[in-house]
């Protein structure tokens, strides 16, 4: 669909991130403690047999759960699948664990811990050593760092095998900062609240996170119902009532990991006009390069035209005119009753020159293969490391 | 418990690592910082390590320490100390611990300091 | 860069009266503060977290409010053991802020 150009499809982004295939090196593979070298962080590379054939922790994870098994992606990555193995060891190997639980970090100082749409934070392991066990995460996280936490229900001896899969984050969204979706009350409640969003919230407002409006799932024409299943109505969009806003507008932040050059903002938007939802009626976008520098020059308006009248969920193309900032903040103003967002992405591209927010710790990243990269992603591009692996169904136990 | 180690008088150039020692807790669940206090002065924030092994360090600190870690030891390197860096060397443990979902970095339990030199 | 303004430099109290001191974040800070007091010789000792919440085994008569940019610590019913120097300090919680200790303000308790 033409019109969804800047957002990303996350079935495509599936791609093995380098455990298996070694592109992952030893020196970003570590742990909070190992039974003996020989069962090393740096041994627990899915369908590896090196060393005693898997990772296994020093200390119980049983009752604590405080033992982990940590890998650097370096670069920002979405990661949207995990896979699991036990210790084979040649047929020698009996530990695996039955579950285990993720932390991520974008930056290697704040954990957030992996929950699925429900809330879960526990997902089901392995049954054997051998086997691999395929979790399809939804959500989907944004990470540098992930961590294994394995679990046990007594004390017992477990061994880690693993791998990650996804692609780069290109987009360079950091987080976004927006007032807390609300409830829409119909026939029944819609509940537009932006439920997987990892920052913090402090009197309705969410800030230093990422959440449903960068997890490129595009919300349908009815906003009542759901691309995904065994969810609440509302559960796709990010909304707003008219009413609780007397400026006329809601304002978003959005910070990025280093200077970019923005050609334009596409914001997908519900125009249910039947049931109050309105596309906004202008938008306008502040820049700035630093947190604690002023704002630059004029603002970038951009009013809305065309089919107002199309009930149709579209994305909106907001141009912002090749702006230099690391720092975006929008207003989106309200035409009708409701404002409701499923997915917001930017077309960029970064400023030479420019070092990334995080740090300095963020080593120049190679494509997979040497080449050009992909062109058909913007805020993503593809690693194509290998072959995609192939997800368990909906409905099995780890999908 | 967390102690600093290794501050001495040194000349201007003459790179020094002040170490910090802990015990209790595990370096592997714990961010630590390092602040310093020069004489008289107020409290001035240099780097961190966070459990995670990454390091950030103050804007004007960049370039001039580094930060690393063992499993039970921090080490602060001054990479080359001038006659400003004369100072009381804190060593801190970040108070969350890292699974937490509360992420600021408040610091509960604090090493006596360690006193650096520099003079020629 | 993220700089924390604290006033006065020094406040004089007797003792059970009260002190305000005020800390002001050049951007937003949220609820990411914290307040430490320092006596001589001594390092810091944590008072006050997330702008409000008390440390365990710290008095009550010590309360921090504030969010945003501007940040107050009250210590009330003051005691001659109060006599330190009081610190903010900015709690990290993106790419946009880092670390940062204030001034300092010196409390005299007479």
């Known amino acids: 669909d033409a019109d969804m150009k800047g957002h990303f499809d996350p079935a495509k982004c599936r791609y093995a991130l380098g455990m298996q295939d070694r592109t992952i090196p030893d020196s970003d593979i570590s742990a909070s403690s190992s039974w003996s070298d020989s069962t090393a962080a740096r041994h627990s590379r899915l369908e590896s047999s090196d060393g005693d054939g898997a990772w296994c922790p020093a200390g119980s994870v049983f009752p604590k759960e405080e033992e982990y098994l940590q890998v650097d992606l370096q670069r920002l990555h979405l990661v949207a699948l995990v896979g699991t193995q036990g210790r084979h060891a040649g047929g020698l190997g009996k530990e695996f664990s039955r579950s285990y639980r993720l932390r991520y970090s974008r930056d290697g100082r704040r954990w957030m811990g992996w929950k699925d749409r429900w809330g879960q934070e526990v997902i089901s392991g392995n049954e054997d050593p051998e086997g691999v066990v395929l979790k399809d995460l939804g959500p989907p996280m944004v990470a540098r760092l992930v961590r294994f936490y394995p679990r046990a229900d007594r004390v017992m001896s477990v061994c880690l095998r693993v791998e990650l899969y996804g692609c780069l984050w290109r987009d360079g969204l950091l987080s976004y900062t927006a007032p807390v979706g609300q409830t829409m009350y119909l026939s029944e409640a819609v509940y537009l609240n932006d439920s997987t969003y990892d920052g913090h919230t402090v009197g309705g407002l969410q800030y230093g996170g990422l959440g449903q409006l960068a997890d490129g799932v595009v919300g349908l024409d009815d906003f009542r119902k759901s691309q995904e299943l065994r969810v609440w109505p509302g559960y796709d969009y990010v909304g707003w009532s008219n009413h609780s806003f007397s400026s006329g507008y809601v304002e978003m932040e959005f910070e990025f990991d280093r200077l970019r050059a923005f050609q334009a903002m596409q914001v997908h938007c519900n125009n249910m006009h039947t049931l109050g939802a309105r596309l906004p009626g202008g938008v306008e976008c502040r820049f700035r390069r630093g947190p604690a520098m002023a704002w630059e020059g004029e603002p970038m308006r951009h009013n809305l035209g065309g089919n107002l009248g199309d009930p149709r969920a579209r994305a909106v193309s907001v141009p912002l005119g090749g702006r230099v900032a690391r720092f975006l903040q929008c207003r989106f103003l309200f035409a009708g009753p409701w404002l409701l967002f499923s997915e917001i992405s930017f077309i960029s591209d970064v400023v030479n020159n420019s070092s990334p927010a995080l740090g300095g710790t963020f080593p120049p990243a190679p494509w997979w293969p040497p080449g050009p990269p992909p062109t058909n992603f913007s805020s993503l591009e593809l690693e194509p490391r290998g072959q995609q692996p192939v997800a368990k169904a909906e409905g099995s136990p780890t999908a | 418990s967390v102690e600093e180690s290794g501050g001495r008088l040194v000349t201007p150039g003459t790179p020094l690592t002040l170490t910090c020692t802990v015990s209790g807790f595990s370096l592997s669940r714990y961010a630590m910082t390092w602040v310093r206090q020069a004489p008289g002065k107020g409290l001035e924030w240099i780097g961190i390590i966070g459990s995670s092994g990454l390091t950030y360090f103050a804007t004007w600190a960049k370039g001039r320490f580094t930060i690393s870690k063992t499993s039970t030891t921090v080490d602060l390197k001054i990479t080359s100390p001038t006659t400003e860096d004369t100072a009381t060397y804190f060593c801190?443990?970040?108070?969350?611990?890292?699974?937490?979902?509360?992420?600021?970095?408040?610091?509960?339990?604090w090493g006596p300091g360690t006193l650096v030199t520099i003079s020629s | 860069e993220l700089v924390l303004t604290q006033t006065p430099a020094s406040v004089s109290a007797a003792v059970g009266g009260t002190v305000t001191i005020n800390c002001q974040a050049s951007q937003n800070i949220y609820s990411n503060l914290a307040w430490y007091q320092q006596k001589p010789g001594q390092p810091p000792k944590l008072l006050i977290y997330?702008?409000?919440n008390l440390e365990s085994g710290v008095p009550s008569r010590f309360k921090g409010s504030g969010s945003g940019t501007q940040f107050t610590l009250t210590i009330s019913d003051l005691e001659c053991d109060d006599a330190a120097t009081y610190y903010c300090q900015s709690g990290y919680y993106s790419s946009s802020t880092d670390i940062a200790f204030g001034g300092g303000t010196e409390v005299v308790v007479k």
């Open positions: 801190a443990r970040g108070m969350w611990y890292d699974d937490s979902d509360d992420y600021e970095d408040y610091f509960n339990l």
């Open positions: 997330g702008a409000s």
